[in-house]
């Protein structure tokens, strides 16, 4: 349905409030260093222009594409070259190359200060003084730090953020009310950002087919009662939504997501029995709820898969007629029967099936050739099962912090060239799989754990891509999306690594560590642990554990001392000397 004015169309569909919020998110995700006030000014100018187009779709420039309008606006920023360097060269290009250029300059790890949470009273005053600016600032700060954050979902987070302040700033104990809510939003926001980053990486690095395969598997697990045709329609629509959001087309994305939620709710009888509650909610909550909805019950008496996909004489005929449709059906049928498998495992099975058919359908006796294809699945299924069992046992034995430390050592030895902050961040997140998934019964552990690990390893991949330092990381990240986790799991100690020069400054600590939160203190210790492994990759687990215990004793002692700074200086030297002598640093 072609519209004379795309900007007018989206303004009318979304409404002024959502339009302005989405344009702000789009601009902040592109120009991550620009001050808040500059973005607000640009958004207001775009909004005023959109209103003129709503009034008269034939008005000047109203027929231009959104990329042209937004790109032209971004290119008016005076300090573009001095702030962004070569990104300014994008402005010399024409659409669609200009937008592609902006997309390529999105920075997953922008050099921005950490967001420090002000005192509750200060936040409540700011909220009451100017609610609109306060909420816009939230969108801006999240969007510029998370340039791939799923924009319509960020609107949902902003709605919850507003609700938290509305409720808690009137409460008797504001802090007790507000802080847990803000913590929850922060943690959920980081998780949401990372999940969306994987979707965008799938689309951008591995293409639409890879994303569609992922979506078929996930939606078939979630909606096992839905027909294949229904799942295929949902996959097509969902792919369009995410392609748009990952491509910076946030207005179209939000509009299409709303349409998809509407369609799902209008057709829930043929999709899932679990959607009723979601579909009674307002739009933003509804879309979020659908995205998180639990798996529906599997239909009773599903026939064996072997009949259609192994025993049938028509396997090669059906495959040859429409390869992707047939593989899609295989994936749908397998996934709806296996909510206990991770999506990536299901995709590995589908890939194995595809490879077998490619080989066997060209053979003299195809049926004889592919008859045992399901036997090839067994080791693929057992590998993640065994890994999860071992790691959950280790997690239960060690607890989260020490489990993270075990992973820090493991991953630093695998890829010691990776920067210490990245190793700490990624290993800490890998370690959270324990608390997140090990509590689940067997049937839910693998989808929880392996699909979560895919999200975390994608963080490693996107951070490493910005500054590549390890061929092994590049190889695991680029060869196969679904085999990233097995690829990293299979890496052994990097024997080619030349240990890092010892630098006493790395192991110098100050009294400020005593006032840090427990989390920040853990990060300091884990940073030291990574550096220790980089200096001494051959150190045993026991030696590293003992040195870390010495470090804990040193911090504990000095934080109790009267003259903390002197204690850190003197005892720190002793600690470094003792560790050097014992480990031969």
């Amino acid at each position: 349905d072609a519209h004379k004015s795309e900007v007018a169309h989206r303004f009318k569909d979304l409404g002024e409030e959502n339009f302005k919020a989405l344009v702000l998110i789009a601009f902040a995700q592109y120009l991550q260093q620009c001050p808040f006030e500059d973005h607000v000014k640009l958004v207001n100018e775009v909004t005023e222009f959109a209103k003129t187009c709503v009034a008269d779709e034939s008005a000047e420039n109203c027929d231009k594409s959104l990329h042209t309008l937004f790109g032209d606006k971004l290119c008016t920023v005076a300090t573009l070259r001095e702030t962004y360097g070569e990104m300014a060269d994008c402005c010399a290009k024409q659409e669609p190359e200009r937008n592609e250029c902006f997309l390529q300059h999105k920075d997953d790890n922008p050099n921005l200060p950490r967001l420090v949470r002000p005192e509750v009273d200060v936040m409540c005053t700011a909220f009451h003084d100017n609610e609109e600016t306060f909420l816009k600032k939230y969108l801006y700060e999240i969007a510029r730090r998370h340039p791939y954050f799923y924009a319509p979902e960020l609107l949902f987070f902003a709605k919850r953020y507003k609700a938290a302040f509305t409720e808690c700033c009137q409460a008797a104990d504001k802090a007790a009310c507000l802080l847990p809510k803000l913590d929850e939003l922060r943690d959920e926001g980081k998780a949401s950002s990372a999940k969306q980053r994987l979707k965008c990486a799938s689309l951008q690095k591995f293409g639409e087919r890879a994303f569609k395969a992922w979506a078929v598997a996930r939606l078939s697990q979630r909606f096992p009662k839905a027909e294949f045709a229904e799942v295929s329609k949902l996959v097509t629509d969902l792919t369009k939504v995410h392609t748009e959001c990952c491509h910076g087309d946030l207005l179209e994305c939000a509009d299409d997501r709303a349409d998809l939620a509407k369609y799902i709710c209008e057709n829930q009888d043929s999709i899932s029995s679990k959607l009723k509650e979601c579909c009674e909610k307002p739009l933003l909550e509804k879309s979020h709820c659908i995205a998180e909805v639990e798996n529906d019950e599997m239909p009773a008496d599903l026939p064996s898969l072997a009949a259609d996909f192994v025993e049938s004489k028509d396997v090669c005929k059906n495959y040859a007629e429409a390869k992707d449709v047939f593989l899609g059906m295989f994936l749908y049928e397998y996934a709806r029967r296996h909510p206990d498998y991770s999506v990536v495992l299901l995709l590995r099975l589908a890939k194995t099936y595809e490879t077998t058919l490619e080989k066997c359908c060209a053979a003299a006796d195809p049926h004889e050739c592919y008859a045992k294809v399901f036997d090839e699945f067994k080791p693929l299924v057992e590998e993640p099962q065994n890994l999860i069992k071992q790691n959950c046992e280790l997690f239960e034995q060690l607890g989260e912090y020490k489990f993270q430390n075990a992973l820090l050592v493991r991953y630093t030895k695998k890829v010691p060239q990776v920067s210490t902050p990245t190793l700490v961040e990624v290993s800490r997140n890998l370690g959270k799989v324990g608390s997140k998934c090990c509590k689940h019964p067997e049937a839910k552990r693998m989808p929880c754990a392996e699909d979560y690990l895919s999200v975390v390893l994608n963080q490693l991949c996107v951070l490493h891509e910005k500054t590549p330092v390890s061929d092994r990381v590049t190889k695991c990240c680029t060869e196969s999306l679904v085999n990233r986790r097995p690829c990293f799991s299979a890496l052994e100690v990097d024997e080619t690594y030349v240990p890092k020069e010892f630098n006493a400054e790395t192991f110098t600590f100050h009294a400020d560590i005593c006032t840090l939160s427990e989390k920040e203190r853990q990060i300091k210790k884990q940073t030291a642990l990574v550096e220790l492994v980089k200096h001494k990759p051959k150190a045993t687990k026991e030696q590293l554990k003992a040195v870390m215990d010495d470090f804990a004793a040193f911090v504990e002692k000095c934080c109790k001392a009267d003259d903390k700074e002197t204690c850190f200086a003197e005892e720190g030297k002793k600690l470094v000397a003792a560790s050097q002598a014992a480990l031969g640093l």
Epitope: G399, A546, D550, A553, K557, L575, A581
Partner: nanobody, 124 residues
Framework: QLQLVESGGGLVQAGDSLRLSCAAS????????MGWFRQAPGKELEFVAR????????YYADSVKGRFTASRDNAKSTVYLQMNSLKPEDTAVYYC?????????????????WGQGTQVTVSS
């Protein structure tokens, strides 16, 4: 499991010296820090000294600093506490303990395996 056996306690005059030993058998000795604690009659268990896994790093309670020296010999799976310039207030049962996997380094709760203790009495 780890067995720890202290020896070397006794009755001495104020100003004298004693050397306590703690011999370990069982679980790996050299992987963990060792601690010395003491308990005077009617008092709480009190931290005295910690010697790290390699024997190169020691921490002491303020009350014994400069007078006591903790050391270890990993080849012999033994930890020592050399006590000089003893005072009557040093009278207590002395225990050696092996560090656990968590908890404070200066608190009994952070130590997993314990000896049976050896009595030290300092008369004035």
């Amino acid at each position: 499991q780890l067995q720890l056996v202290e020896s070397g306690g006794g009755l001495v005059q104020a100003g004298d010296s004693l050397r306590l030993s703690c011999a370990a058998s069982g679980r790996t000795f050299s992987d963990y820090a060792m601690g010395w604690f003491r308990q005077a009659p009617g008092k709480e268990l009190e931290f005295v000294a910690r010697v790290n896994w390699s024997g190169l790093l020691t921490y002491y309670a303020d009350s014994v600093k400069g007078r006591f020296t903790a050391s270890r010999d990993n080849a012999k799976s033994t930890v020592y506490l050399q006590m000089n310039s003893l005072k009557p207030e040093d009278t207590a049962v002395y225990y050696c303990a092996q560090r656990g996997d968590s908890g404070s380094n200066f608190d009994p709760s952070g130590y997993r395996y314990w000896g049976q203790g050896t009595q030290v009495t300092v008369s004035s």
